[in-house]
């Protein structure tokens, strides 16, 4: 059983990378002297208590920054937020912390990240770029939900 987070880099199909700006993740075109975030991810250890065939349930954080991605409702709208949280603290909890979990599905080189707390809502970036990461139900329209995840070993 892997009980340390794996590290990875993410870009979307338009070759935009994730950058941390004022405690918000945004997707921007890769440029010189830019510091894309390194993702930390770890599978939930209570996988048997979650839905099967939806993907691998993972906690997603920013490597070395004690920040994790989570989903919460603002009004009636599920939103993507960054919270100060140790990813291993989430991993070790006695139950899945669903607000911080995502079903990671891979199809070829493409990865999607579906909220466990809000099924049908996916991490996305606006096709325009330079915008914050969001959650969307609208697949393949104005938002990009397919990402390339490259593991760093």
């Amino acid at each position: 059983k892997i009980d340390t987070p794996q590290r990875g880099s993410i870009q979307d199909i338009n070759h935009r990378v994730w950058v941390l700006q004022d405690q918000t993740l945004i997707a921007v075109p890769r440029k010189d002297r830019m510091s894309p975030v390194t993702i930390a991810l770890i599978s939930c250890r209570h996988v048997e208590t979650l839905e099967k065939d939806r993907g691998n349930p993972i906690y997603l954080g920013l490597n070395g920054l004690n920040l994790c991605l989570m989903c919460a409702k603002v009004g009636d709208q599920p939103t993507l937020q960054l919270k100060e949280k140790d990813i291993m603290d989430l991993y070790n909890q006695p139950e899945p912390v669903k607000s911080f979990l995502f079903y990671h599905s891979q199809s070829g080189r493409n990865s999607t990240f579906e909220s466990v707390a809000f099924p049908g809502w996916f991490i996305a970036v606006s096709s325009e770029g330079g915008c914050p990461l969001i959650l969307t139900q609208e697949l393949g329209k104005a938002n990009t939900t397919d990402f390339g995840l490259t593991m760093l070993f």
Partner: antibody, heavy 121, light 109 residues
Framework: EVQLQQSGAELVKPGASVKLSCTAS????????MYWVKQRPEQGLEWIGR????????RYDPKFQGKATLTADTSSNTAFLQLSSLTSEDTAVYYC??????????????WGRGTTLTVSS | QAVVTQESALTTSPGETVTLTCRSS?????????ANWVQEKPDHLFTGLIG???NRAPGVPARFSGSLIGDKAALTITGAQTEDEAIYFC?????????FGGGTKLTVL
């Protein structure tokens, strides 16, 4: 206001089955885990198991595997505990409780007032 | 299966500090046991106090605190009040299941 309303007392015969209910108000059971706990007279608490009402997955204490069945109906915001092949050992008060994550940990934050089950011929 | 042991009864006075403990038959209690503490008052009135060893549940008075003392989980009430008279149960996680202790009857005289 968050409340867990449990069904009324039951008197049942040995060998029978019973289904106890726990109806939540003030929150959606799909957003949390629902736990069931047994308390016998002059004894401590025993964890029976839990259900994730959003997807129906369950966990049981090994002692209650086969004895207890946990289900939930999200449309009525209700969790259920079914006990089968009842014996006098099942005479107890049964509680439902919400086990919720807030900030940095899981807590038993709200409890029902219990359902008294008496098994007697 | 693990057995969780608590003091059967303790007595304290208003304003005093009292510590209740929770021992595991499998060895030292650690943060991996995610100790929970629950209060039971008459007429089946339960309230969750502590989760994850030392995290107070929302709305719980600051006089209640959880910790590890030696090889046990502990609940400390700093400045006990008469309304704290109750039975206190601890519960410890062992992998995928939860085990409750027998409870401590706290009297505040």
């Amino acid at each position: 206001e968050v409340q867990l309303q449990q069904s009324g007392a039951e008197l049942v015969k040995p060998g029978a089955s019973v289904k106890l209910s726990c109806t939540a108000s003030g929150f959606n059971i799909k957003d949390t885990y629902m736990y069931w706990v047994k308390q016998r007279p002059e004894q401590g608490l025993e964890w029976i198991g839990r259900i994730d009402p959003a997807i129906g997955t369950t966990r049981y204490d090994p002692k209650f595997q086969g004895k207890a069945t946990l289900t939930a109906d999200t449309s009525s915001n209700t969790a259920f505990l079914q006990l089968s092949s009842l014996t006098s050992e099942d005479t107890a008060v049964y509680y439902c409780a919400r086990y919720d994550y807030s900030g940095s940990s899981f807590y038993f934050d709200y409890w029902g007032r219990g359902t008294t089950l008496t098994v007697s011929s | 299966q693990a057995v969780v042991t608590q003091e059967s009864a303790l007595t304290t006075s208003p304003g005093e500090t009292v510590t209740l403990t929770c021992r595991s038959s499998t060895g030292a209690v650690t943060t991996s046991n995610y100790a929970n503490w629950v209060q039971e008052k008459p007429d089946h009135l339960f309230t969750g106090l502590i989760g994850g060893t030392n995290n107070r549940a929302p709305g719980v008075p600051a006089r209640f605190s959880g910790s590890l003392i030696g090889d046990k989980a502990a609940l400390t009430i700093t400045g006990a009040q008469t309304e704290d008279e109750a039975i206190y149960f601890c519960a410890l996680w062992y992998s995928n299941h939860l085990v409750f202790g027998g409870g401590t009857k706290l009297t505040v005289l």
